[in-house]
């Protein structure tokens, strides 16, 4: 393992001394450190026209270390590289450069994008969403009874969030109106006071509905006769069928 030849010796330079500072084992007035104490790294720093030897506990930024049997030596990385494994492979680039496969580039190749946190070129990642869930039960104000027209919802999950240049995510929730066979709420489903309050409020809404084509929001109306009600229901069912044929749906976007 030992070096076969060319080991630096103190005879190399007339001004070699062993009264050195900063981790040097041998040094000279002109060249600084010539060799280092055990476990320290020898690095040549250029100062003007001359190179000065320095001994450090680890290699500085822009250098990598090799532990030879007789010397621990720092070698310069390529100019645009801040940290490297060896001459060929950079692991962190200098500011303004992006790392790609061990090289430092000023912009990322086609099909890749710059990650400005890691300063690396990474693959563009597109959004991936799951399949839609089944439609929820037809509901109105959190209940599945006491109304004829409500809304139903379906959702999906984002499986993969996109990177900066990736395709955006689609809506994760979709809502549409629905019609059900009206059924009265059982006693357990609403209280007396609530029923009275709702009836008053809903009567107002029913009046509104006779003069508009908005969704039916009411329970039974105390104003309409059963015949009127039946007529109205038939009309609304026809409208609903026509709407279903057109497959109109209202999308509520929750884009991630």
């Amino acid at each position: 393992q030992n070096a076969s030849r060319g080991r630096r010796q103190r005879r190399m330079h007339p001004n070699v001394s062993q009264g050195c500072q900063g981790g040097c084992a041998t040094c000279s007035d002109y060249n600084g450190c010539l060799s280092c104490k055990p476990r320290l790294f020898f690095v040549l720093e250029r100062i003007g026209m001359k190179q000065i030897g320095v001994c450090l506990s680890s290699c500085p930024s822009g250098y990598y270390g090799t532990r030879y049997p007789d010397i621990n030596k720092c070698t310069k990385c390529k100019v645009d590289c801040d940290t490297c494994f060896n001459k060929n492979f950079c692991t962190k680039c200098k500011s303004g450069f992006y790392l790609h496969l061990g090289k430092c580039l000023d912009s990322c190749p086609e099909g890749l994008e710059a990650n400005n946190h890691t300063m690396e070129c990474v693959s563009i990642v597109h959004c991936e969403a799951s399949e839609w869930s089944p439609w929820s039960p037809c509901m109105k104000k959190g209940k599945t009874c006491g109304f004829k027209r409500g809304t139903e919802t379906r959702v999906r999950d984002i499986l993969q969030h996109p990177s900066a240049k990736g395709n955006l995510c689609p809506p994760t929730s979709e809502t549409r109106t629905c019609i059900v066979q009206r059924k009265k709420c059982s006693k357990g489903e609403r209280g007396k006071k609530g029923r009275e309050r709702k009836r008053k409020k809903l009567n107002k809404e029913e009046r509104k509905e006779t003069s508009s084509s908005s969704d039916s929001k009411g329970l039974e109306s105390s104003i309409e006769t059963p015949d009127q009600q039946e007529n109205k229901e038939r009309q609304q069912q026809q409208k609903r069928r026509a709407r279903d044929k057109q497959q109109k749906s209202v999308s509520v976007s929750t884009v991630h």
Epitope: S4, Y68, F89
Partner: antibody
Framework: EVQLVESGGGVVQPGRSLRLSCAAS????????MAWVRQAPGKGLEWVAT????????YFGDSVRGRFTISRDNSKNTLYLQMNSLRAEDTAVYYC?????????WGQGTMVTVSS | DIQMTQSPSSLSASVGDRVTITCLVS??????FVWYQQKPGKAPKLLIY???RLQDGVPSRFSGSGSGTDFTLTISSLQPEDFATYYC?????????FGQGTKLEIK
Amino acid sequence: EVQLVESGGGVVQPGRSLRLSCAASGFTFSDYDMAWVRQAPGKGLEWVATIIYDGSRAYFGDSVRGRFTISRDNSKNTLYLQMNSLRAEDTAVYYCTAHDRSFDYWGQGTMVTVSS
Amino acid sequence: DIQMTQSPSSLSASVGDRVTITCLVSEDISNDFVWYQQKPGKAPKLLIYAASRLQDGVPSRFSGSGSGTDFTLTISSLQPEDFATYYCQQSYKYPPTFGQGTKLEIK
């Protein structure tokens, strides 16, 4: 394109000598430490020797120290391995390789057979 | 010298399998660690350097992990061209030492 081409292998009797050469192209030869790595038939990889970029220092594996010498001619982009006092256990494919902590570039190898 | 213990020494697997090879090192080497692939009759080829960095041209199904004394090479979905012998190497200090190799064979 990086190319390392070994030559000089062959069949040799125990105790005799052989000199391997490796011609390099496609990279700055004088910037790299160069090494020889060998592989006995059906066995794993074994580092043999490394010479630093300027030829001033060389290092050897325990099994070859004192018998093998490594040298280089940067003007000719060529690496050498002088193998003396060869033994049967030196039988292997010898690869020339650029050694910079990892072995980044490899030649195709040259077979050395030591047999009486 | 730093000792490298690679396991398993051989492994049978099928195309599409996920495969893991490990290398234990006798002392802490940080991430100064390399993986090579060698096919019969060919020279070794550097796959991964600095424990986890892929060499240019190496498919992304290969990945390396670990630091200190425990290192792993994973092939996420084996392809026919991946059947070869894999070696680990420590690049922390001289002398450079290799693992014994893992021969990956078709089941």
